[in-house]
């Protein structure tokens, strides 16, 4: 089965459909897929050279 028209850009695409809690909407494939959680670490102490990088938690199967 083919996906929708490939010329359909993100700004034209239908709004993401609600997904179940363990999923999120992937604009690339325009469907709900398994998703992990994003997390932002606590800021480094004052004077630290750079902010802590944003990281992620692995998706749940």
């Amino acid at each position: 089965m083919r996906r929708g028209p490939r010329s359909l850009r993100g700004r034209d695409a239908p709004a993401p459909t609600p997904c179940v809690p363990a999923e999120c909407f992937d604009l690339l494939v325009r469907h709900c897929v398994a998703c992990g959680l994003l997390r932002t670490p606590r800021p480094k102490p004052a004077g630290a050279s750079s902010p802590a990088p944003r990281t992620a938690l692995q998706p749940q199967e």
């Epitope: 359909l8 993401p16 999120c24 909407f25």
Partner: antibody
Framework: EVQLVESGGGLVQPGGSLRLSCAAS????????IHWVRQAPGKGLEWVAW????????DYADSVKGRFTISADTSKNTAYLQMNSLRAEDTAVYYC??????????????????WGQGTLVTVSS | DIQMTQSPSSLSASVGDRVTITCRAS??????VAWYQQKPGKAPKLLIF???YLFSGVPSRFSGSGSGTDFTLTISSLQPEDFATYYC?????????FGQGTKVEIK
């Protein structure tokens, strides 16, 4: 441990066919999209196709549309790339990769986190 | 299709240098950009996704920034193992095209 293993590459004459396989372990392919990416000798990465096994959605690069078919068998946890009408310019290492997604405001933020080792396809007479 | 243009195509740098690679999209891709590192004969490795998120296990000397059409990968202090080719890729819409690559060589 997540692993992707490609197979099926080899030497084929122009106009010929090959079927590549991408066997997944450590995760179920129905939970994400699987992509084929190729790299011609000394060149950069070129995305080829993707499949969303849970629903059968697919898409292709213009350069292979009508000649290549991507598919998946969730019971075997394996994705495939059927390559027909092969041309010399299809000569490349073919990688399969999993797209990982993280939830950012309900939308996927992601990239291709696991890749196979690659399989070489040579199209030559 | 959205085109991704990387610059420079190659650069020479020394261990300890700060290295910046840029990627420009032909259309707005929001923050849907990933960066990969590839060494000869090996599969690419994911470094950064969603423009600025560091992938698990990637050293913190790598960072990404940008949104819309202009994106940057920065290596704050180049290490010997960082000499490789780097690619950007968007995933805002299909097809998810790659940049042409930037080869980081030893000066």
């Amino acid at each position: 441990e997540v692993q992707l293993v490609e197979s099926g590459g080899g030497l084929v004459q122009p106009g010929g066919s090959l079927r590549l396989s991408c066997a997944a372990s450590g995760f179920t392919i129905s939970s994400s999209s699987i992509h084929w990416v190729r790299q011609a000798p000394g060149k950069g990465l070129e995305w080829v196709a993707w499949v969303l096994p849970s629903v059968g959605f697919t898409d292709y690069a213009d350069s292979v549309k009508g000649r290549f078919t991507i598919s998946a068998d969730t019971s075997k946890n394996t994705a495939y790339l059927q390559m027909n009408s092969l041309r010399a310019e299809d000569t490349a290492v073919y990688y399969c990769a999993r797209r990982v997604c993280y939830n950012r405001l309900g939308v996927c933020a992601g990239g291709m986190d696991y890749w196979g080792q690659g399989t070489l396809v040579t199209v030559s007479s | 299709d959205i085109q991704m243009t990387q610059s420079p195509s190659s650069l020479s740098a020394s261990v300890g240098d700060r290295v910046t690679i840029t990627c420009r999209a032909s259309e707005d891709v929001s923050s849907a950009v990933a960066w990969y590192q590839q060494k000869p004969g090996k599969a690419p490795k994911l470094l950064i996704f969603a423009a600025s998120y560091l992938f698990s296990g990637v050293p913190s000397r790598f960072s990404g920034s940008g949104s819309g059409t202009d994106f940057t990968l920065t290596i704050s202090s180049l290490q010997p193992e960082d000499f490789a080719t780097y690619y950007c890729q968007h995933s805002q819409v299909s097809p998810p095209t790659f940049g042409q690559g930037t080869k980081v060589e030893i000066k």
